[in-house]
């Protein structure tokens, strides 16, 4: 028996359902009474779900997993993982035993899009050219950690005097705060781009300083 899984990681958004695909080629005359199937975490070998003795033994993992019972006899041993969490990320092994055995591992990559950045300025009044200002770009509830880029109005990257911090909340999602310290010119636009490297999703924020008032 040969077990096949997708070589590319499965990307799943937090709080959505994901399908970890696994298939095998049943011999002629195959019946589910002959099948033993185990899904487990590859690294820790923790049991996730199993099918044996002709029965779905159910989820051993947060009660959020399910097989596709009607498709098993056709060799579809895929696992449905419901309401995906950050902690579900990792490698899962599908182990199939009939009169032979084989296994293969599939990776689950969890992702969450970042919110549109909010921009704050300090100080935010009585600004004059030559003043040093601190611009903070904040984006929330994303995963995995973001890449943050700053540019001026001409699209020139601003790399000096940038401090970025990322903190995970209780769900494992990141809030990102990036601070740019810059000396004001006569007027100017400062843009912050927060990129989710898995989703290739860009969230943009900008502030334009033209004297008073400020434009965000």
């Amino acid at each position: 028996v040969e077990v096949q899984v997708s070589e590319d990681p499965v990307v799943a958004l937090v709080d959505t359902d994901a399908t970890l695909r696994c298939s095998f080629s049943p011999e002629p005359g195959f019946s589910l009474a002959q099948l033993n199937l185990i899904w487990q975490l590859t690294d820790t070998k923790q049991l996730v779900h199993s099918f044996t003795e002709g029965r779905d033994q159910g989820s051993a993992y947060s009660n959020r997993t399910a097989l596709f019972p009607d498709l098993l006899v056709q060799g579809n041993a895929s696992l449905r993982l419901q309401r995906v969490r950050v902690t579900d990320e990792g490698s899962y092994t599908c182990f199939v035993s009939i009169q032979d055995f084989d296994s293969a591992a599939v990776s689950l990559q969890v992702a969450a899009p970042y919110s549109k950045p909010s921009m704050t300025l300090e100080p935010n009044k009585d600004l004059r050219p030559g003043n040093m200002v601190t611009i903070t770009c904040s984006s929330y509830q994303g995963y995995p950690e973001a890449e943050v880029f700053w540019k001026d109005g001409q699209g020139v990257p601003l790399t000096g005097n940038v401090t970025t911090s990322q903190m995970a909340n209780e769900r494992g999602l990141f809030d990102v705060h990036s601070v740019l310290r810059v000396v004001l010119g006569a007027n100017g636009t400062y843009s912050c781009l927060v990129r989710n490297p898995v989703l290739q999703q860009d969230a943009h924020g900008s502030v334009t300083i033209t004297g008073q008032p400020l434009t965000f």
């Epitope: 028996v1 033993n36 487990q40 049991l47 009169q99 032979d100």
Partner: antibody
């Protein structure tokens, strides 16, 4: 008749090497997983290693990992166990077994004796 | 130290019914199944019960198996003198990725 016939056992010193063979007949050897199981004198059964039908998936007991190698030649209907760095505790009767549904082993050879002693 | 736990010995008189227990965990018997082997003195083991309760052809129906949760048992009814042997339970352990045997139970027919 389904048969498994082990050979290659013998007496050797600690640190030595030995290769066991198991000749299979009476069934489609290339369609089944195979195991080696051993039994030390007066002791119980201990699973040693398993290999799937095409040799792509292999498992070992921790006690032999890194020292023993299971392999198969489907063109010769033969299963092998290469044993290196042998220790006194490897002394046992070694059985070749055919894999069956539900993790079972439905056919066993008569066994071949390996004695490791100085 | 075996992963599956069996009593080292059991006994009965001819005609009696005896049971042998096998205790495992969620990652072996609980997740998969259990198989039983009989080893008569001086011979190779023989598959007696597979998938917890099924008998291969040629095994008398005096032998039966059952499983509940993480434990299993082998029952022999109408005990006969030729049943005197060692009995082993075995399973696949999903947490170890290995096949595991119980320590064996020596059955004596009195």
């Amino acid at each position: 008749e389904v048969q498994l016939l082990e050979s290659g056992g013998g007496l050797l010193q600690p640190g030595g090497s030995l290769r066991l063979s198991c000749a299979a007949s009476g069934f489609s050897f290339s369609s089944y997983g195979m195991h080696w199981v051993r039994q030390a004198p007066g002791k119980g059964l201990e699973w040693v290693a398993a290999i799937n039908s095409d040799g792509s998936r292999i498992y070992y007991a921790d006690s032999v990992k890194g020292r023993f190698t299971i392999s198969r030649d489907n063109s010769k209907n033969t299963l092998y166990l290469q044993m290196n760095s042998l220790r006194a505790e490897d002394t046992a009767v070694y059985y070749c077994t055919k894999y069956y549904y539900h993790y079972a082993m439905d056919v066993w050879g008569q066994g071949t004796t390996v004695t490791v002693s100085s | 130290q075996s992963v599956l736990t069996q009593p080292p010995s059991a006994s009965g008189t001819p005609g009696q019914r005896v049971t042998i227990s096998c205790s495992g965990s969620r990652s072996d018997i609980g997740a998969t199944t259990v198989n039983w082997y009989q080893q008569l003195p001086g011979t190779a083991p023989k598959l007696l019960i597979y998938q917890s309760h099924l008998r291969p052809s040629g095994v008398p129906d005096r032998f039966s198996g059952s499983k509940s949760g993480t434990s299993a048992s082998l029952a022999i009814s109408g005990l006969q003198s030729e049943d005197e042997a060692d009995y082993y339970c075995a399973s696949w352990d999903a947490s170890l990725n290995t096949w595991v045997f119980g320590g064996g139970t020596k059955l004596t027919v009195l």
